[in-house]
């Protein structure tokens, strides 16, 4: 239990089009040092959804204050969900490296499905 684990508790989240989707993720440790990133899909073709360290992600907000000391909650909320957002989202811990950070451990994934907007 000492080594960092990535907890993505929900296997599946269903959201109506136009609403926000909350994707939960937490780490069991602050070590190793390095950023968290969220991806849609796995493997080489995965899409970056959020990078804790850098970048502009206008539809993504963090659920808790990531600058807070000892914060282990890296959940995100994605606004204005559309059917194109459906897929499996992975919360991934990276280990700080030089020159590049190295992927350390991934969560098990959360499948996001999108329901038609209620009429």
């Amino acid at each position: 239990e000492d080594e960092l684990q990535v907890i993505q508790p929900e296997k599946s989240v269903s959201v109506a089009a136009g609403e926000s989707a909350t994707l939960r993720c937490a780490m069991t440790s602050l070590i190793p040092v390095g950023p968290i990133m969220w991806f849609r899909g796995a493997g080489a073709g995965r899409e970056l959804i959020y990078n804790q360290k850098e970048g502009h992600f206008p539809r993504v907000t963090t659920v808790s204050e990531l600058t807070k000391r000892n914060n282990l909650d890296f959940s995100i909320s994605i606004s204005n969900i559309t059917p194109a957002d459906a897929g499996t989202y992975y919360c991934v811990k990276f280990r700080k490296g030089s020159p590049d950070d190295v992927e350390f451990k991934s969560g098990a994934g959360t499948e996001l499905s999108v329901r038609a907007k209620p009429s």
């Epitope: 907890i7 508790p9 296997k11 599946s12 937490a26 069991t28 282990l72 909650d73 451990k105 499948e111």
Partner: antibody
């Protein structure tokens, strides 16, 4: 060896509230998922809700929404389930259970259970 | 909510014979990304809390005798006790652990014929 020890039996009046505790020993409490399950006399198992202390917020079955509050105190490794507006149909054994997972996999079942707390609602 | 339907409600089987319990979920509990079914089976004896027997539909929990086996995928699942022993008399429950609320089946009481 993980253990869950629950508080003792309670007898309550209709309309009152009951708060049941579940103290964990062993393992890392903050990353546990603790579920509460109840069983009325001669009946089946009913999932009421659960909490993962590391996230802080609980989720509840619709049937109990607004009447049940599940909390966790990481400093004492204790989870709590409070049920309000009690009625005779709430007479049951209430169990806490730890949901289990392997490394960074999903939670997949409840592998450690408390001994159960009998709550009797009677006027 | 996902509705779990167990059958039969009760089952009487001779010692050494096979016992089969069925469980049907109202929607799939298969997580496609890892091809695992989030379906668990529990055994409960009178006056005791439930005990986890099977998870991921077919993986035996540590210490569970190999006469217990689980099968199925998607929405249809089966728990089999290949050779019923006296200590297997209990109520058996399936539970989906895919989407909260993590609903249980109604239970199947297994007795000796």
């Amino acid at each position: 060896q993980v253990q869950l020890v629950q508080s003792g039996a309670e007898v309550k009046k209709p309309g009152s509230s009951v708060k049941v505790s579940c103290k964990a020993s062993g393992g890392t409490f903050s990353s546990y998922a603790i579920s509460w399950v109840r069983q009325a006399p001669g009946q089946g198992l009913e999932w009421m809700g659960g909490i993962i202390p590391i996230f802080g917020t609980a989720s509840y079955a619709q049937k109990f929404q607004g009447r049940v509050t599940i909390t966790a105190d990481e400093s004492t490794s204790t989870a709590y389930m409070e049920l309000s507006s009690l009625r005779s149909e709430d007479t049951a054994v209430y169990y806490c259970a730890r949901e289990t997972r392997q490394d960074s996999a999903h939670y997949y079942g409840m592998d450690v259970w408390g001994q159960g707390t009998t709550v009797t609602v009677s006027s | 909510d996902i509705v779990m339907t167990q059958s039969p409600d009760s089952l009487a089987v001779s010692l050494g014979e096979r016992a089969t319990i069925n469980c049907k979920s109202s929607q799939s509990v298969l997580f496609s990304s890892n091809n695992k079914n989030y379906l668990a089976w529990y055994q409960q004896k009178p006056g005791q809390p439930p005990k986890l027997l099977i998870y991921w539909a077919s993986t035996r929990e540590s210490g569970v005798p190999d006469r217990f086996s689980g099968s199925g995928s998607g929405t249809d699942f089966t728990l089999t006790i290949s050779s019923l022993q006296a200590e297997d008399v209990a109520v058996y429950y399936c539970q989906q652990h895919y989407i909260a609320p993590f609903t249980f089946g109604g239970g199947t009481k297994v007795e000796i014929k």
